[in-house]
Interface confidence: low
C-alpha cells in the first residue's frame, strides 16, 4: 500500500532488472518540505526487503551513502531469481510511538538472458491446415520474454507471429495461421525463433524444411467396403484421401482380435482389394496416409469402419452322436444330436439342418429340416440304418456328415476295459480306459459320453460327448461339468458296424451328502427284513454316492450300532438284512457316502421283528 510516492522517490542503479549475481544500489530521497516536522536532522530513512509480500530483511546496515535527513543509498546483493520488493520508510526518531511511514518502493527483477531457442519443429495438419511450430525455450528466464516466430519462403515471402512467457504462461508454440499449398511442394522454407527480454536477446539457428517435411495428411475419410459378388472373403476397401497422398497403410482385424493385419498400398487412389477376409465376421478397418514414399509423416489413423463380411456356405464336418431306445418288439426311437459349427466353419447364421435317416438298402429314407441341434424319429428295428446331417446358411449347405446307427453297447468284446474317472479340478474330469481285449474288428474311434445323474436327465438334456482317436486312451471332459454333481460317463468303442461300451460314474468335486436316505418302510418276509428308502434329493447328494449304510441297534442300547454297507445302484431302493432278533425293538437309520465322507443320518425308524430270525 504505497501511497503513490508523495513523500519521496526510490531509484535503482544500474536498472530495476538485473542479471543473477549482480548487485544494485537503491536510493531513497525525500521530496522538499517532506520528512519529520521541522527537524530534518531527525529524518531516518530505512529500507525493507519483501519476498512474496513477507518482510525478510531490514537493510539498515547496508547503507553506502547518506545525506542526513534528505536521502540514503543502500547496496543490495545476493538477490534470488524472480521479483523482490523494496520499500523505503521514514522513521522520525524523536517520536518513538509512531510507526515508520512509507515513502516509496521499487521492484527489482532478477533473471537471465534468453538462450537460443532449439529443436524447432513445424507441422501442417492436412493440405488445408495451417503451419504451427514448437520449440524448446531453454532455461527459464524469470523475466517476461517475447518470442517471435518468423517464416520466410520463396519470393521473399515472410510472415511472423509473437507470444510471450512470464511467470503465468509459457510460450513455446505458435500457429502462424497460414496454409502452405501443395504447389509449393518443391520450395524450401526457413523458420527461426527470436527471444528478447530486458537482459538480452537470442535467435535460433535457421530451420529449413519443405512442404513434404511438415505436412501430415488428414486421416482418410468416407471409408467403405464393397464385397465382390457378395463374397465373404474378398472385398474392395474404398476411401477418400487428400489429393497428394501416394502411400497408404491399411490395418484391419476381427473385432475380438488383438493383432492387426497390416498392408502397405502405393498409389492406391482410394481403393484396395482385400482377399483374405473371414466370412461373416465383424471387422474393424483403419487407414493412414503419407504424401511421399520415403519422406514425410504418416497421418493419424482414420476413424474405424466397422462392418461384417457377408456369409459363405458352411464348411467343416458336423460332430454327430445318437441314442437308441427300443420302444417295442419291432420299433426303436433314434435321437440324433450334433454340435453347432464354430463360427469359422459356419461362415454365417445357420438357418437349419438337413437330417436324413436312411435304411442302407435304400428301402426307406426319412428326411427333415430342423433349426435345433437334435432330431428324434421312430424307425423299424430291422435293417441297417445310417444318418446324415448338414448345416445350411443363406449361401448354401455344408457337406453331409454320415454316421452308421449301430447297437452302441451291443458287443461285449468291444467294451473298453479299466475305465476310470478322476477329478482334475473344479470343472473337469479325467477319463481313462484300456482298449477292448478281444475285439474282432478294429476300433475306429472312441466316444466319451457324459450326462448328469439327475431325474429326467435322459429326456430333458442332450448328452455331451467327445470323439477320441483310436490310439488315445484318455479324455479330459469339461463341457458342462459342475462341481458336486455326479455324472454317468460312458466310453464307447465303435467299429464300422458294431459298438461296445463301459460305464462309470464320476464327479469333478465332492462333499459329504447333506442328508441320508429316508427309510420309507420296513417289511418282514421269509425271516428277513426288507429296508426300503427314497434316494437323497439330487441337489443334496453333492457328488457321486459310492454306497449306502444301514445302521441298527436295540432301542435303548448304548452299544455301537451294527451296519451293513450296500454298493450304490440308482435302480435299487430296498435291501434285506437278516441278523435281527425276533421280538426285540430296533432303531434303524441310513447314511450315504461319497469320496468326501459320510452324510448325517437320515430318519430313524423303529421295528420289532416278529418271526424267527437266524
Amino acid at each position: 500500500n504505497i501511497d503513490v510516492c508523495k513523500l519521496g522517490t526510490v531509484t535503482v542503479q544500474p536498472a530495476p532488472v538485473i542479471p543473477l549475481g549482480s548487485a544494485a544500489n537503491i536510493s531513497c530521497s525525500l521530496n522538499p518540505k517532506q520528512g519529520c516536522s521541522h527537524y530534518p536532522s531527525s529524518n531516518e530513512l530505512i529500507l525493507l526487503k519483501f519476498v512474496n509480500d513477507v518482510l525478510v530483511e531490514n537493510l539498515h546496515g547496508k547503507k553506502v551513502h547518506d545525506h542526513t535527513g534528505h536521502s540514503s543509498t543502500f547496496q543490495v546483493t545476493n538477490l534470488s531469481l524472480g521479483m523482490t520488493l523494496f520499500v523505503c520508510k521514514l522513521n522520525c526518531s524523536n517520536s518513538q510511538k509512531k510507526p515508520p511511514v512509507p515513502v516509496c518502493g521499487v521492484e527489482i527483477s532478477v533473471g537471465v538472458a534468453p538462450e537460443p531457442p532449439q529443436n524447432i519443429s513445424c507441422v501442417q495438419e492436412g493440405e488445408n491446415g495451417t503451419v504451427a511450430c514448437s520449440w524448446n525455450s531453454g532455461k527459464v528466464t524469470y523475466l517476461k520474454t517475447n518470442y517471435t516466430l518468423q517464416l520466410s519462403g520463396p519470393n521473399n515471402l515472410t510472415c511472423q507471429k509473437q507470444c510471450f512467457s512470464d511467470n503465468r504462461q509459457n510460450c513455446n508454440r505458435l500457429d502462424l495461421g497460414i496454409n502452405l499449398s501443395p504447389d509449393l511442394a518443391e520450395s524450401r522454407f526457413i523458420v527461426r525463433v527470436t527471444a528478447i527480454n530486458d537482459l538480452g536477446n537470442s535467435s535460433s539457428l535457421p530451420h529449413t524444411f519443405t512442404f513434404l517435411d511438415i505436412v501430415i495428411p488428414l486421416p482418410p475419410w468416407d471409408i467403405r467396403i464393397n464385397f465382390l459378388n457378395a463374397s465373404g472373403s474378398r472385398g474392395t476397401l474404398q476411401w477418400e484421401d487428400e489429393g497428394q497422398v501416394v502411400l497408404n497403410q491399411l490395418r484391419y482385424q476381427p473385432l475380438n482380435s488383438t493383432s492387426w493385419n497390416m498392408v502397405n498400398a502405393t498409389n492406391a487412389k482410394g481403393k484396395y482389394d482385400l482377399r483374405d477376409l473371414r466370412p461373416f465376421t465383424e471387422y474393424e478397418f483403419q487407414i493412414s496416409s503419407k504424401l511421399h514414399l520415403s519422406g514425410g509423416s504418416w497421418s493419424n489413423w482414420s476413424e474405424s469402419l466397422r462392418t461384417r463380411t457377408p456369409e459363405e456356405e458352411p464348411v467343416g464336418i458336423l460332430d454327430i452322436w445318437y441314442m437308441k431306445q427300443d420302444i417295442d418288439y419291432d420299433r426303436q426311437q433314434i435321437s440324433l444330436f450334433w454340435k453347432s459349427l464354430n463360427p469359422s466353419e459356419a461362415r454365417g447364421k445357420i438357418l437349419h439342418y438337413q437330417v436324413t435317416l436312411q435304411e442302407v438298402t435304400k428301402k426307406t429314407t426319412l428326411q427333415n429340416t430342423t433349426r435345433h441341434t437334435s432330431w428324434t424319429r421312430v424307425i423299424p428295428r430291422t435293417g441297417a440304418w445310417t444318418a446324415s446331417v448338414s448345416a445350411a446358411n443363406s449361401k448354401g449347405a455344408s457337406a453331409p456328415t454320415h454316421i452308421n446307427i449301430v447297437d452302441l453297447c451291443g458287443t461285449g468284446l468291444l467294451a473298453p476295459h479299466q475305465v476310470s474317472a478322476k477329478s482334475e479340478n473344479m470343472d473337469n474330469i479325467l477319463v481313462t480306459w484300456q482298449p477292448p481285449k478281444k475285439a474282432d474288428s478294429a476300433v475306429r474311434e472312441y466316444i466319451v459320453e457324459w450326462r448328469a445323474l439327475q431325474p429326467g436327465s435322459i429326456t430333458k438334456f442332450p448328452p455331451h460327448w467327445l470323439r477320441i482317436p483310436p490310439d488315445n486312451m484318455s479324455a479330459l471332459i469339461s463341457e458342462n461339468i459342475k462341481p458336486y454333481i455326479c455324472y454317468e460317463i460312458r466310453v464307447h468303442a465303435l467299429s464300422e458296424s458294431q459298438g461296445g461300451c463301459s460305464s462309470i460314474r464320476g464327479d469333478s468335486k465332492h462333499k459329504a451328502p447333506v442328508s441320508g436316505p429316508h427309510i420309507t418302510a420296513i417289511t418282514e418276509k421269509k425271516e428277513r427284513l426288507f429296508i426300503s428308502w427314497t434316494h437323497i434329493p439330487f441337489p443334496e447328494q453333492r457328488g457321486c454316492i459310492l454306497h449306502y449304510r444301514i445302521y441298527w441297534k436295540e432301542r435303548d442300547s448304548t452299544a455301537q450300532p451294527e451296519l451293513c454297507e450296500i454298493q450304490y445302484r440308482r435302480s435299487q431302493n430296498s435291501h434285506p438284512i437278516s441278523s435281527l432278533q425276533p421280538r426285540v425293538t430296533y432303531v434303524l437309520w441310513m447314511t450315504a457316502v461319497t469320496a468326501a465322507g459320510e452324510s448325517p443320518q437320515g430318519n430313524e425308524r423303529e421295528f420289532c421283528p416278529q418271526g424267527k430270525a437266524n
Epitope: 492436412g126 488445408n128 488428414l218 475419410w221 468416407d222 471409408i223 467403405r224 467396403i225 464393397n226 477418400e240 487428400e242 476413424e303 474405424s304 469402419l305 466397422r306 462392418t307
Partner: nanobody, 127 residues
Framework: QVQLQESGGGSVQAGGSLRLSCAVS????????MGWFRQAPGKEREGVAA????????YYADSVKDRFTISKDTAKNTLYLQMNSLTPEDTGMYYC????????????????????WGQGTQVTVSS
C-alpha cells in the same frame, strides 16, 4: 444439449425449387460431418448430401448430383440444402444429421453412423 431443427419443406410442382435449412444449437461446425437424408414412405432412409467441415469435402448421392447443393453458414450455425429441378421421386421426409461418429460400409450415406438428428421436414413434389 445439441439440437437440430429443419425447416423449408413444403409442396412444390415438378421442376420447382426448395431450400431446406437446419439450425444447429449446442454444437460447433468445426471438423464434423453433417448431412441431409430423406425417407420416402415404405423405404429406408437414404443419404442425399453431406459436408465434411474439417476438410471441406462435399458429397452427393448420384440421384441428386447437379440438382442439389449443400452449404453451411458457420456464423449462423446453419446447414442448407438447395434443391432445384425437383421430381416426384424427391418426395419424402428430409432429415438433417450431424457428427458422424461411427463408420459403416456405406460411409457418409449410412444413417446409423450419425450421432445427432433433427425431427425432419416434409417435401412433396407433385407432377
Amino acid at each position: 444439449q445439441v439440437q437440430l431443427q429443419e425447416s423449408g419443406g413444403g409442396s412444390v410442382q415438378a421442376g420447382g425449387s426448395l431450400r431446406l435449412s437446419c439450425a444447429v444449437s449446442g454444437y460447433t461446425f468445426s471438423n464434423h460431418h453433417m448431412g441431409w437424408f430423406r425417407q420416402a414412405p415404405g423405404k429406408e432412409r437414404e443419404g442425399v448430401a453431406a459436408i465434411y467441415t474439417g476438410a471441406g469435402n462435399i458429397y452427393y448421392a448420384d440421384s441428386v448430383k447437379d440438382r442439389f447443393t449443400i452449404s453451411k453458414d458457420t456464423a449462423k450455425n446453419t446447414l442448407y440444402l438447395q434443391m432445384n429441378s425437383l421430381t416426384p421421386e424427391d418426395t419424402g421426409m428430409y432429415y438433417c444429421a450431424a457428427d458422424l461418429t461411427r463408420w459403416y460400409s456405406g460411409g457418409w450415406r449410412d444413417p446409423r453412423g450419425y450421432k445427432y438428428w433433427g425431427q425432419g421436414t416434409q417435401v412433396t413434389v407433385s407432377s
